[in-house]
């Protein structure tokens, strides 16, 4: 969370941004809020990126002005135009690229004053893992798969019964480059699993942490997955 202040004569406004992460190839949002101003035509929003000449996006007089937009953002950005008057200057970013990572500035000018705040935008790839019972194996084993990760994550297994146990000797993890030659598919197999136990497959890099749980009993298999972005907010 970054709060910036600006001074215009006697007036300043508070601008707030949130560090966030973008998933390569998906659409993302760079969050920015400011003190609302009902005079839409008097609001100017400028998004800038460190090291880039030209603007990422500009919104003024109630509409976009992309005349100064840098080529790398062409056709990829939009503000939530109907939410500008209530203080939302967040930017939608289409088809997030690795090169979109960096420091962005959300600059606001209204009839009340002006202000700005910086935002650290991380880019990578992250996806939910899915665990299945691997019936092809000679012994009962579990297969944890997640289709898209970057940078290369670490993978660890845990179990409810054997808390604190190290499963690295009885698991095998591989990383397979996807067709776009950036992201990778993660596959990890855990061998010699026992029934009536809950196992967790944890995948983590510096952007996200994902966990897949599986409970195998005689009568059923229960699964649960969750994904958490790191250093956000």
């Amino acid at each position: 969370l970054i709060i910036g202040f600006g001074i215009s004569g006697k007036h300043f406004i508070t601008v707030t941004t949130f560090t966030s992460a973008g998933n390569i190839g998906e659409d993302g949002t760079l969050s920015c809020t400011f003190e609302p101003d009902i005079k839409l035509n008097g609001i100017v929003i400028q998004w800038l990126k460190e090291g880039i000449k030209g603007l990422v996006h500009e919104f003024k007089e109630g509409k976009d002005d992309l005349s100064q937009q840098h080529e790398m953002f062409r056709g990829r950005t939009a503000v939530f135009a109907d939410q500008v008057v209530v203080g939302n200057a967040s930017l939608r970013l289409k088809n997030v690229q690795l090169t979109d990572a960096g420091t962005y500035t959300c600059y606001i000018r209204t009839s009340k004053g002006k202000g700005n705040a910086n935002l650290e935008y991380k880019t990578g790839a992250f996806s939910m893992p899915e665990i299945n019972v691997d019936y092809n194996a000679s012994s009962e084993s579990l297969r944890c798969e997640a289709p898209r990760w970057f940078p290369q994550p670490t993978v660890a297994w845990a179990s409810q019964v054997d808390q604190g146990a190290n499963f690295s000797e009885v698991s095998n993890t591989s990383f397979e480059l996807n067709s776009e030659n950036v992201t990778m598919k993660v596959v990890s197999v855990l061998y010699n699993v026992t029934i009536n136990n809950t196992y967790s497959c944890m995948i983590e890099n510096d952007i996200a942490k994902a966990t897949g749980d599986i409970k195998v009993t005689d009568s059923e298999v229960k699964r649960r997955s969750q994904l958490q972005l790191l250093n956000s907010g």
């Epitope: 002005d65 992309l66 005349s67 080529e71 056709g75 990829r76 939009a78 088809n95």
Partner: antibody, heavy 120, light 107 residues
């Protein structure tokens, strides 16, 4: 409501330059949230996106045609234009102009289209 | 560039029946997909954008779904004016590309 109308020669000789103009009425070409695009459709075939332009003059072209395409804009006349050089019979198509959202990048509305035949 | 593949090439349906058209992208386009309708001698008309949002004035019988690489356009009850060619278009990355089209004809 916003309307677009293509105009230009219907017949162009091989190796020459195809030139078309799109006139926008019922709205300003200086609309901040839109690009202005060209799309073509060979007879009986599918659609091919050629490229677009912003009112400030910045352009993006389909790489497959980039070496031959020029799109320009005249805000005073509320028009934008397409030039395609060194044409061959394969460039025979109905050429459409359309308004393109800056994002989401839908195409709406479209002009009625104009058939350009490349033949000697 | 991203290749868009539509199926079937031709769909024969009786008036009042449901039509389901498919569009597949060669790589993920998230939800950055539009559908257009084209009648003979006319320009295409925008039906759906954002994979599932109906454009202004488009009847509720048209609906879009899907994300990533698999998309569907459904016409819940075909009217006589719906017989046409339908195209999908990705606007996820330049150059924007169209599918080859699906012709919906009267059975």
């Amino acid at each position: 409501q916003l309307q677009l109308q293509e105009s230009g020669p219907g017949l162009v000789k091989p190796s020459e330059t195809l030139s078309l103009t799109c006139t926008v009425s019922g709205g300003s070409i200086k609309s901040g949230s839109h690009y202005w695009g060209w799309i073509r459709q060979p007879p009986g075939k599918g659609l091919e996106w050629i490229g677009n332009i912003y009112y400030s003059g910045s352009t993006y072209y389909n790489p497959s045609l980039k070496s031959r395409v020029t799109i320009s804009v005249d805000t005073s006349k509320n028009q934008f234009s397409l030039k395609l050089s060194s044409v061959t019979a394969a460039d025979t198509a109905v050429y459409y102009c359309a308004r393109e959202g800056s994002y989401p990048n839908w195409l709406d509305p479209w002009g009625q289209g104009t058939l350009v035949t490349v033949s000697s | 560039e991203i290749v868009m593949t539509q199926s079937p090439a031709t769909l024969s349906v009786s008036p009042g029946e449901r039509a389901t058209l498919s569009c597949r992208a060669s790589q993920s386009v998230s939800s950055n997909l539009a559908w257009y309708q084209q009648k003979p001698g006319q320009a295409p008309r925008l039906l759906i954008y954002g994979a599932s949002t109906r454009a202004t004035g488009i009847p509720a019988r048209f609906s879009g779904s899907g994300s990533g690489t698999e998309f569907t356009l459904t016409i819940s009850s075909l009217q006589s004016e719906d017989f046409a060619v339908y195209y999908c278009q990705q606007y996820h990355s330049f150059p924007f590309t169209f599918g080859g089209g699906t012709k919906v004809e009267i059975k």
